[in-house]
């Protein structure tokens, strides 16, 4: 951007510049071209020697300029147009300047002026061109600086040329106010900071509703001496609730939102949200719908699932296999898990209570992802009720629960009562008993044993009787022994696990029950 301090051509002859000597050297002239007056300062005293004609501009306020550019448009006539080449004729003129803090008015003193340059034309106007009105216009530019006073004058010295000065334009350069990457850069005077640093670094200001991204660099640009912006660094982003539209940040329209400062546009409110107001940073969930803490704001709001479908409990002696299908309504989420709880009731008293501690699950009964689980170690003559609850990421945000229940009665044998009959260093003789009324239902007994503390030495023996001798055991070793009745329906109740110890090789006769 050029900031013009003086423009002779634009002033339409209204500038009364000082001429010295008055009226005999430079003077203002008017010509009409295309019905428009063209003004020029001209001088053409080529036949008289010793010309020293000065034309001084009015005082020009410097404003913020440090270096100024002077553009001259002028014509110079060929000295050969004049008789004998006019020995005193010249084809150049001199350009001067003087700085001052005040306007000296008509007080003109040559000694105050410093020469900028001798101005020579690229093209001179020869006689034939002049008479054919085909004058050759020259354009020359000079730079002056640094300036330090409040203002300055320019002066043109004629020493015997035939010159017409049509345009004098004085300006300085600024990098214009600019919007770039949502940052506003102020109008900046184009100055070289130093010879080695020809660029001025300028910090930008984020436009309304834009911010420097977290951890990012603030916007910077470089203003060159030629008044051009270069090398943008950093950026601004539209803050939450606003999106970039051309060079501004505009509030998200109703029904749209933006949750963070980013380059992304506003997003439409997802499903199951209420219509947002202008400039929304999120969209509220509809009643009955929720957002889990880890859910992105762009995700639809969801709700807890309905209860599992078709829960079945299949009794297999002292075991039950629970099977169910996924809820009809998943609540719009994929993160469904199931949890199983167990309640047992005594038929005689009708008393009920939780049974998690006494039963065994084939896998942990909380946060199940599969739709089946086996429950074992059920007690005979007991009614069990199993509840399977479906949960998802937003279930914790409501108090109601979505579960289905199934009940099963266990008409199993009572667990065998086991005791150690005899032992040696390498064997254990174990006996058991069950109520006579249940004996007819028992098909066989299954004895499982292993060394205590050794999960890999698992052994099973089956027998139809009420005793078994376990051989080939290690001396002075504790074994874990359990007896379970096998019935037509499957496994019956198992006895509790007993610890029996073989004798040491010294032959101690102690019995452990």
């Amino acid at each position: 951007k050029e900031v013009v301090l003086l423009d002779f051509a634009a002033m339409k002859g209204e500038l009364g510049w000082l001429t010295h000597p008055y009226g005999k050297g430079w003077d203002l002239m008017q010509n009409i071209m295309d019905d428009m007056p063209i003004y020029m300062y001209s001088v053409c005293n080529v036949v008289s020697g010793d010309q020293d004609n000065w034309l001084r501009t009015n005082w020009v306020y410097r404003e913020e300029a440090e270096r100024i550019f002077i553009e001259l448009k002028f014509t110079v006539r060929d000295c050969n147009s004049f008789p004998g080449g006019a020995s005193s004729c010249k084809e150049t003129f001199n350009l001067y300047y003087a700085e001052s803090d005040v306007d000296y008015g008509t007080n003109f003193q040559k000694r105050q002026f410093t020469k900028i340059d001798t101005i020579a034309p690229d093209e001179i106007t020869v006689s034939s061109d002049f008479e054919a009105r085909n004058v050759k216009l020259n354009v020359e530019e000079r730079m002056v600086g640094p300036l330090t006073r409040k203002g300055f004058y320019l002066a043109f010295q004629d020493i015997g040329a035939c010159v017409a000065l049509l345009s004098v334009r004085v300006y300085y350069k600024k990098c214009p106010e600019m919007l770039q990457s949502l940052a506003r850069f102020p109008e900046t005077i184009a100055v070289a900071v130093s010879d080695t640093q020809p660029l001025a670094t300028v910090a930008g200001t984020c436009v309304d509703h834009a911010v420097v991204p977290y951890g990012g660099e603030g916007p910077l640009m470089h203003c060159t001496v030629d008044g051009e912006w270069l090398v943008p660094i950093g950026q601004c982003l539209c803050q939450e609730g606003y999106e970039k539209v051309e060079d501004a940040c505009r509030a998200c329209s109703p029904g749209f939102f933006k949750s963070e400062a980013s380059e992304s546009p506003c997003l439409e409110c997802p499903e199951h949200t209420l219509p947002s107001t202008e400039g929304a940073t999120s969209c509220q969930c509809e009643e009955g719908y929720f957002r889990a803490p880890e859910d992105p704001l762009s995700m639809s709001c969801t709700r807890p699932p309905s209860a599992p479908n078709y829960l079945t409990a299949i009794g297999m002696g002292a075991k039950v296999e629970l099977r169910w299908t996924a809820p009809k309504d998943t609540g719009g989420r994929q993160d469904i898990v199931y949890s199983v709880t167990c309640e047992q009731c005594w038929p005689e008293s009708g008393e009920c209570g939780p049974c998690e501690a006494s039963v065994r699950y084939s896998e942990p009964p909380h946060a199940l992802t599969r739709t089946s689980v086996t429950v074992s170690d059920l007690e005979p003559h007991m009614n069990y009720t199993f509840a399977v609850e479906a949960r998802n990421g937003v279930s914790g945000l409501v108090t109601s629960r979505s579960f289905r229940t199934a009940s099963v009665s266990i008409n199993q044998t009572e667990p065998p009562k086991v005791r150690l009959e005899d032992r040696s260093t390498t064997s254990l003789s174990v006996t058991w008993s069950i109520p006579v009324s249940q004996q007819s239902r028992v098909w066989k007994y299954e004895v499982t044993y292993r060394k205590k503390g050794d999960a890999n030495s698992y052994n099973v023996r089956r027998t139809e009787g009420f005793s078994v001798t376990l051989d080939d055991l290690a001396p002075d070793t504790t074994y874990l022994v359990q007896v379970q009745a096998l019935t037509q329906e499957g496994q019956g109740a198992g006895s509790k696990v007993h610890e029996f110890q073989t004798l040491s090789t010294e032959g101690s006769a102690n019995m452990a029950v």
């Epitope: 005999k24 008017q30 010509n31 001209s42 080529v46 010309q51 147009s81 008789p83 009105r133």
Partner: antibody, heavy 120, light 110 residues
Framework: QVQLVQSGGGLVQPGGSLRLSCAAS????????MHWVRQAPGKGLEWVAV????????YYADSVKGRFTISRDNSKNTLYLQMNSLRAEDTAVYYC?????????????WGQGTLVTVSS | SSELTQPPSVSVAPGQTVTITCQGD??????ASWYQQKPGTAPKLLIY???NRPSGVPDRFSGSSSGTSASLTITGAQAEDEADYYC????????????FGGGTKLTVLG
């Protein structure tokens, strides 16, 4: 409208003095250089003097230098020519004229003229 | 010298073209201005610069210049054009500020 109205002419004896006035109207008087031009009876036009727009510069024809003084009062929009040591050859119709641009003209507005007769 | 020389008189038949000339060294450097003066009135500017006419001046008046000569041409002269015509120019010698030609009396015959 734009005009120059002159006054102050008359008969004066040789060696006498006279002051001519030229009242301007219809334009910004203080922006223009002003001239006096005279015309002896039956003769051509002769340039006499010029004054710059602000009164800071004055020039005279050799024939009147030292005897005539050109001045102006921009607050009154008036141009003056003080003529001293008048001679018979100064007898003429005196015109004030406006230089349309610069110092030297052209002269686009002229007064109606006022006759100065120097005779004993 | 700083003189401008004009013919003392010229004549023209109505409707014909007439040219009045002005000679002088200053005209090599500066354009002439032309003035018309009718008896008992002040001069009136006709032409200035390259060939510029102030508003109100009929376009039958035109100016030209070449070397040390300037010309005023009246194309299709009319009876009311009978008057004295003066050329004027800046003085390139620096002796004077401005100079007038001696004037030319134009007679429109008939």
């Amino acid at each position: 409208q734009v005009q120059l109205v002159q006054s102050g002419g008359g008969l004066v004896q040789p060696g006498g003095s006279l002051r001519l006035s030229c009242a301007a109207s219809g334009f910004t008087f203080s922006s223009y250089a002003m001239h006096w031009v005279r015309q002896a009876p039956g003769k051509g036009l002769e340039w006499v003097a010029v004054i710059s727009y602000d009164g800071s510069n004055k020039y005279y024809a050799d024939s009147v230098k030292g005897r005539f003084t050109i001045s102006r009062d921009n607050s009154k929009n008036t141009l003056y020519l003080q003529m001293n040591s008048l001679r018979a050859e100064d007898t003429a119709v005196y015109y004030c004229a406006r230089a349309s641009v610069g110092a030297t003209g052209p002269f686009d507005i002229w007064g109606q003229g006022t006759l100065v007769t120097v005779s004993s | 010298s700083s003189e401008l020389t004009q013919p003392p008189s010229v004549s023209v038949a109505p409707g014909q073209t007439v040219t009045i000339t002005c000679q002088g060294d200053s005209l090599r450097s500066y354009y002439a201005s032309w003035y018309q003066q009718k008896p008992g009135t002040a001069p009136k500017l006709l032409i200035y610069g390259e060939n510029n006419r102030p508003s109100g001046v009929p376009d039958r008046f035109s100016g030209s210049s070449s070397g040390t000569s300037a010309s005023l041409t009246i194309t299709g002269a009319q009876a009311e054009d009978e008057a004295d015509y003066y050329c004027n120019s800046r003085d390139s010698s620096g002796t004077h500020l401005t100079v007038f030609g001696g004037g030319t009396k134009l007679t429109v015959l008939g």
